[in-house]
Amino acid sequence: CKAMHVAQPAVVLASSRGIASFVCEYASPGKATEVRVTVLRQADSQVTEVCAATYMMGNELTFLDDSICTGTSSGNQVNLTIQGLRAMDTGLYICKVELMYPPPYYLGIGNGTQIYVIDPEPCPDSDF
């Protein structure tokens, strides 16, 4: 018996508007009905929780109102979008998946997605 496998892309480049999207896919060993997904950021030996959501299989993924994350779920796949990113937010973003119900509980952690964020150049002043 091993830890539940979680797959995510190795690298993602955020858009010029500071938006990054990636898929987090897990190999469910059972028929979970309640799943918790957490996005963690590891950078400079610090680990912070970016966002988290618990959802019922077949239902929408709902993050807190003030969350910088949005997402949708389809089967054992979660499509995550992180907004409002700046260059200082560059780091390794890790997908943590917990199968909460019914028992038994399972935990899986992806190998992380390195998200690169490049702040856009300010627009030059215009005479127009």
Epitope: C1, L40, S45, V47, T48, I94, K96, L107, G108, I109
Partner: nanobody, 127 residues
Framework: EVQLVESGGGLVQPGGSLRLSCAAS????????IGWFRQAPGKERETVAC??????SYADSVKGRFTISRDNAKNMVYLQMNSLRAEDTAVYYC??????????????????????WTQGTQVTVSS
Amino acid sequence: EVQLVESGGGLVQPGGSLRLSCAASGSTLDPFVIGWFRQAPGKERETVACINRSRTSYADSVKGRFTISRDNAKNMVYLQMNSLRAEDTAVYYCAASPDKPFYTDQTMCNKHYYGYWTQGTQVTVSS
């Protein structure tokens, strides 16, 4: 799936010793990092120590006093606590995390990466 059960808590005098044990069933410990954490009343749960196949890591507050070890053949992890102080009083938890290549000595014990939490065992250091 892995299931963890801890034991060994109790009341001990300052300067005394205790050994906590964490027994795993349902899986080999090999692919996991096993961590010990504690939570004192009114405080956040904090890292004590953790161990994977080849590395150990400790919170600064317990370095030199606590020793974490694992016996893969018995599927056990131990926390030997010496020179106990009143500030070590807390509920102690054992938890597991899949061992990942990006874990560093500084992050492999981070509580965010853990699951399979035990119910906790009370350790009280008092005269």
